[in-house]
Interface confidence: medium
Amino acid sequence: HTAAQDNCTCPTNKMTVCSPDGPGGRCQCRALGSGMAVDCSTLTSKCLLLKARMSAPKNARTLVRPSEHALVDNDGLYDPDCDPEGRFKARQCNQTSVCWCVNSVGVRRTDKGDLSLRCDELVRTHHILIDLRHRPTAGAFNHSDLDAELRRLFRERYRLHPKFVAAVHYEQPTIQIELRQNTSQKAAGDVDIGDAAYYFERDIKGESLFQGRGGLDLRVRGEPLQVERTLIYYLDEIPPKFSMKRLTA
């Protein structure tokens, strides 16, 4: 993979180490933590990004509460196992031999078990609901302007094909972005909705993964769109398997 030839950096992933050791002295970038080569002309997979993040620990985030309707990333940061393509391995275990199954965005979808736990396949997250609350503004945003700007953002910044942005809902101050992408719909080279959602989440939190100078400056008709709360819900192609104890807790 090539990266910027001028100063050998990866524009899509600042959590990389780059050096001109590729074929013909070309710049090659490797993700921190895993050492895997990354393609700097597209988004890096969430698994490799999480692994890189764990290799350079920062203060823990405040986590959202789980929803009864969908999976929420309620377990927080962990050091994931990624397959050779950079995807999450279906089974994840910690250093104390506690294991669990995850979906394609790395969110736990079963109760925790021991090393005997089997996760037969990596279940695809096909529907992501991004729930945002924006800071108070003089008036509500125009819905069609907001819709167009968010669709443009996902198309232009994250390179997500427009057909995967299913809907943008708005009831001031709540904005909901629905991303849908079935296994059958995702062609080779398509950005994964899970990766796009993760980049968006980090952008919104002011923790951009892009190498560029500034963070995301999102505006609707010139008016800044400042987000004060983000919740992301994940729906899998196969429903998660949690015990009744957890569901009634």
Epitope: E156, G212, R213
Partner: nanobody, 124 residues
Framework: QVQLQESGGGSVLAGGSLRLSCTVS????????MAWFRQTPGKEREGVAA???????KYAGSVKGRFTMSRDNAKNTLLLQMNSLKPEDTAIYYC??????????????????WGQGTQVTVSS
């Protein structure tokens, strides 16, 4: 580095057309936001049109409907088709490139690489 070279400027009568071209070379050319700016003596450089890799072009209100911007990522070329030219379109036109993977805007501060410029003169 990224290098940009404009061509296609010249003199034309009001109501006429010109087609500006910008050849871009360097790293991550297709992933960069690209724009056309123009500047007249004593005035700030202003954004005319901008485009990202996959997006639709954005235009300044003064040129909307008259100018059409496009890019050919295979040839690393940026084009600006200018129709129905007016004397107030007279300026030096600059091609600009932004950071890779940034959104296309008409703000000068979002662009870090610039061409040398090509003169466009529209007379009545």
């Amino acid at each position: 580095q990224v290098q940009l070279q404009e061509s296609g400027g010249g003199s034309v009568l009001a109501g006429g057309s010109l087609r500006l071209s910008c050849t871009v070379s360097g790293s991550f050319v297709s992933s960069r936001s690209m724009a056309w700016f123009r500047q007249t003596p004593g005035k700030e450089r202003e954004g005319v049109a901008a485009i990202s890799q996959y997006g639709d072009p954005k235009y300044a209100g003064s040129v909307k409907g008259r100018f059409t911007m496009s890019r050919d990522n295979a040839k690393n070329t940026l084009l600006l088709q200018m129709n129905s030219l007016k004397p107030e379109d007279t300026a030096i036109y600059y091609c600009a490139a932004g950071e890779a993977w940034e959104l296309a805007t008409l703000s000068r501060s979002d662009y870090i690489y610039w061409g040398q410029g090509t003169q466009v003169t529209v007379s009545s």
